[in-house]
């Protein structure tokens, strides 16, 4: 069971990143699915290595003082959402914006029907060029 | 099937990074090989988690305006090269240069004879000190 | 065999990061253990994908000229410590400090009784907020 999906620019104002089965994507079988373009949902309980990569372009003067944060989050049936992993990068002083890449990854127990998704502080700063931003998992 | 190889400084002007089976490297068996010191080639079709880490030292004034980009690329028999993953980091203002580390990783389907390699925008900026720059894969 | 542990702030002055089985941690069975809150120790020989993520907040003026370095290290029974992976990030010019995240990961052969741990140049700069700093492994 494995998946690798590709970032998709979105007009939605939500902080949850959007993904698509396009380009060189992976969706090994129907035991993992991409739902609503925003979350990977698994049908089998078990340990999964889950990862995300986010490339963004931001400028210190044009952004809030808070850093750019990417969060890998979990929603299990009947449970609250919870943060699994986060990464933070202070905005660049480069103009018009400076690019930076974040990589998140870790091993987590998922229940049947659990979904994982990626949140960012400012989706408009995310880079969607080939290979820059992706999201995936593999069952151990 | 798994491999982990170590960066090697090269006098070649190519943007493709060079690697060696030295230090604490891994080459599990002959189903994965390091070819010409530049690409990992697999004999078996399947899903692989492929990763690379690149540490580099650069300075904004001494570099082009474009960021430092590391790309994980795929060459399958009879197919064009394609980019699997990229990461970008704007150059540092630190002098003489500022170090930054990039990590790339994802799950991809590889065909028999497929090769993966790592490209960077400026190989002269890559750090080859122990553990700083490496490349590997594992078959799921 | 898999583990994922969560960073813990420590009053110790050691450069070795401290970890805990808390929050959304993973400890699959007793073939991997967290020892003294500082190292993951495996009982079985084999290939492991080992990873660490470290988020830190530092300022160029308040720090040494050297970058922030995170090292993934190995101690095998009867052998000296050795470095598996390192990442380096130059300190930010942001005030009071600028956050940055480092991700390390690779495939390594571990012997029975081998321990892996994470060293940083300045533990006081490490961020321990939810999900920011973690450490884990999985047996292939």
């Amino acid at each position: 069971i494995a998946a690798h999906v590709i970032s998709e620019a979105s007009s939605k104002t939500t902080s949850v990143l959007q993904w698509a089965e396009k380009g060189y994507y992976t969706m090994s079988n129907n035991l993992v699915t991409l739902e609503n373009g925003k979350q990977l949902t698994v049908k089998r309980q078990g340990l999964y290595y889950i990862y995300a990569q986010v490339t963004f372009c931001s400028n210190r003067e044009a952004s809030s003082q808070a850093p750019f944060i990417a969060s890998l989050c979990l929603k299990s049936p009947g449970r609250f959402e919870r943060i699994l992993l986060r990464a933070a990068n202070t905005h660049s002083s480069a103009k018009p914006c400076g690019q930076q890449s974040i990589h998140l990854g870790g091993v987590f127990e998922l229940q049947p029907g659990a979904s994982v998704f990626v949140n960012v502080t400012d989706p408009s700063q995310v880079s969607h060029g080939t290979g820059f931003t992706s999201f995936g998992l593999l069952k151990l | 099937i798994a491999a982990h190889v170590i960066s090697e400084a090269s006098s070649k002007t190519t943007s493709v990074l060079q690697w060696a089976e030295k230090g604490y490297y891994t080459m599990s068996n002959n189903l994965v090989t390091l070819e010409n010191g530049k690409q990992l080639t697999v004999k078996r079709q399947g899903l692989y988690y492929i990763y690379a880490q690149v540490t580099f030292c650069s300075n904004r004034e001494a570099s082009s305006q474009a960021p430092f980009i590391a790309s994980l690329c795929l060459k399958s028999p009879g197919r064009f090269e394609r980019i699997l993953l990229r990461a970008a980091n704007t150059h540092s203002s630190a002098k003489p240069c500022g170090q930054q580390s990039i990590h790339l990783g994802g799950v991809f389907e590889l065909q028999p004879g497929a090769s993966v390699f790592v490209n960077v925008t400026d190989p002269s900026q890559v750090s080859h000190g122990t553990g700083f720059t490496s490349f590997g894969l594992l078959k799921l | 065999i898999a583990a994922h542990v969560i960073s813990e702030a420590s009053s110790k002055t050691t450069s070795v990061l401290q970890w805990a089985e808390k929050g959304y941690y993973t400890m699959s069975n007793n073939l991997v253990t967290l020892e003294n809150g500082k190292q993951l120790t495996v009982k079985r020989q084999g290939l492991y994908y080992i990873y660490a993520q470290v988020t830190f907040c530092s300022n160029r003026e308040a720090s040494s000229q050297a970058p922030f370095i995170a090292s993934l290290c190995l101690k095998s029974p009867g052998r000296f410590e050795r470095i598996l992976l390192r990442a380096a990030n130059t300190h930010s010019s942001a005030k009071p400090c600028g956050q940055q995240s480092i991700h390390l990961g690779g495939v390594f052969e571990l012997q029975p009784g081998a321990s892996v741990f994470v060293n940083v140049t300045d533990p006081s700069q490490v961020s321990h907020g939810t999900g920011f700093t973690s450490f884990g492994l999985l047996k292939l």
Epitope: - | K22, G23, H128, G129, T130 | A66, R82
Partner: nanobody, 117 residues
């Protein structure tokens, strides 16, 4: 061409001290971690100590811990090994090397340290 030139060896009594130096040229010294290794008469190479590019992180073999100190001066492209409380078993040819013991691609011609009364 990469060159590593060790100096500072000699004859010293047990309990005495020596400071070894290694002058590096032909590569960007600050871009590499460095090691000291030694070879006792009739024995194999033994790793002694390691230092990172900036002198922030160091490692020592158990046999020398607390007695030897590795350091570097990047402005002078020089690596040092301060050896205190020397013992007869420290007698060896000492080499400096680029990177770690498993990875060294270059090392010098060595300097002989003899500890004897």
């Amino acid at each position: 061409e990469v060159q590593l030139l060790e100096s500072g060896g000699g004859l010293v009594q047990p309990g005495g001290s020596l400071r070894l130096s290694c002058a590096a040229s032909g590569f960007t010294f600050i871009a590499y971690d460095m090691s000291w290794v030694r070879q006792a008469p009739g024995k194999g190479l033994e790793w002694v100590s390691w230092i990172d590019e900036w002198g922030l992180q160091t490692y020592y073999a158990d046999s020398v811990k607390g007695r030897f100190t590795i350091s570097r001066d990047n402005s002078k492209n020089t690596l040092y090994l301060q050896m205190n409380s020397l013992r007869a078993e420290d007698t060896a040819v000492y080499y400096c090397a680029k990177k770690t013991p498993e990875e060294f691609d270059y090392w010098g011609q060595g300097t002989l340290v003899t500890v004897s009364s």
